[in-house]
């Protein structure tokens, strides 16, 4: 079998909401995969699951099934959501987020994101993580890649 | 409905001291930043001090940095404005107002209070 | 600082008739993010400031539509479709671009 590539494109788009009683915030993070197949046969992505981590919190996890099937030499970029919080027990990140005097909200977030597919009864799983900025402070469409924090991607000098 | 009444308002000698209260109602005060707002006989309005919900953030202009301090707290809904080395020039109304972050603006306003400053 | 000029004065109005405010920032208070950070308050007499417009074309929460607000980076209006006498009072704008956070000197509206 040749391979199975998954590749992590970006933050599509963050919607964000706020409780002002609970002091959270409610960020609905919506990914983009492209997920090639190399084989001459169809393959089933059976499941993506995908966890979203701010300094090392877990702050959200999204599992979805029986997504697509992927047809020979074929490549479908699936969109995902990650409906994330963070909450009272990161204070002051609320505080950052609803901030009136800073106009662009970035945080750093660990995306992390496995897709499961299977051919011929054999499953295989494919694992990407990738640091992403996201705006905490309002509603962001982003463009492809546009999101991507480089700094940590980088190797260390 | 939202409510934001200031008090401690009064006439004070140059260089003298005095503090500023604003109690809210009406909505969660712990959830969001305040600003102080002044007013002066002129009838011009100038930002004098913001402070974040929870305490992280604060904020003031040049023009009173080191002579008013913001403070709030949320168990008593109470924004406070310490005010010291008072100047003539600091004769004004102060209206504390509240911060709607999806606005991105204060929306309501107390009615504010008045110090004059003269000797 | 970013300065905010306004005149002081409308031209007078008759009730009924439409009014512009105009308001004029030193430096562009249109963000990369595509907001333009510019405000509208009203002072009624005897009263405290309300808001009227958030970021420059978005009316607050129970202000009549018969106003609107619109703008480039630098230069505003503020318009009044058809003017009532509860309009009254001093027009405010504003901008939190930047700290510290500026505001106009106001312009009275004049009713004829």
């Known amino acids: 079998p040749r391979s199975i590539e998954v590749k992590y494109i970006g933050v599509k788009s963050a919607y964000v909401s706020y409780d002002a009683e609970k002091r959270t915030i409610y960020l609905n993070i919506t990914n983009t995969l492209n997920i090639t197949n190399n084989n001459y046969y169809s393959v089933e992505v059976e499941n993506i699951t995908a966890q979203v981590q701010f300094s090392k919190t877990v702050i959200g996890k999204a599992r979805l099934n029986n997504i697509t099937n992927i047809g020979p030499l074929d490549m479908k970029q699936i969109d995902y959501t990650v409906p994330t919080v963070i909450a009272e027990e990161m204070s002051y990140m609320y505080d950052f987020c609803t901030l009136l005097s800073i106009k662009v909200h970035n945080i750093v977030l660990m995306m992390q994101v496995t897709v499961t597919t299977a051919y011929f009864g054999h499953s295989e799983q494919i694992s990407q993580e990738r640091y992403q900025y996201v705006d905490c402070g309002r509603n962001t469409t982003y463009q492809l890649a546009q999101s991507e924090y480089l700094n940590v991607l980088q190797p260390q000098q | 409905e939202v409510q934001l009444v200031e008090s401690g308002g009064d006439l004070v000698k140059p260089g003298g001291s005095l503090k500023l209260s604003c109690v809210a109602s009406g909505f969660t005060f712990s959830g969001y930043g305040m600003s102080w707002v002044r007013q002066t006989p002129d009838k011009r309005l100038e930002w004098v001090a913001t402070i974040s919900s929870g305490s992280f953030y604060i904020y003031y202009p040049d023009s009173v940095k080191g002579r008013l301090t913001v403070s709030r707290d949320n168990a008593k809904n109470t924004l406070y404005l310490q005010m010291s080395s008072l100047k003539s020039e600091d004769t004004a109304i102060y209206y504390c107002?509240?911060?709607?972050?999806?606005?991105?603006?204060?929306?309501?306003w107390g009615q504010g209070t008045t110090l004059t400053v003269s000797s | 600082d970013i300065v905010m000029t306004q005149a002081a004065f409308s031209n007078p109005v008759t009730l009924g008739t439409s009014a512009s405010i105009s308001c004029r920032s030193s430096k562009s208070l249109l963000h990369s993010n595509g907001i333009t950070y510019l405000y509208w308050y009203l002072q009624k007499p005897g009263q405290s400031p309300q808001l009227l417009i958030y970021q420059m074309s978005n009316l607050a929460s129970g202000v009549p539509n018969r106003f609107s607000s619109s703008g480039s980076g630098t230069d505003f209006t503020l318009r009044i479709s058809r003017v009532e006498a509860e309009d009254v009072g001093v027009y405010y704008c504003?901008?939190?671009?930047?700290?510290?956070?500026?505001f106009g000197g106001g312009t009275k509206l004049e009713i004829k």
């Open positions: 107002a509240r911060q709607n972050f999806y606005y991105g603006c204060e929306d309501y």
């Open positions: 504003a901008q939190n671009l930047e700290l510290p956070w500026t």
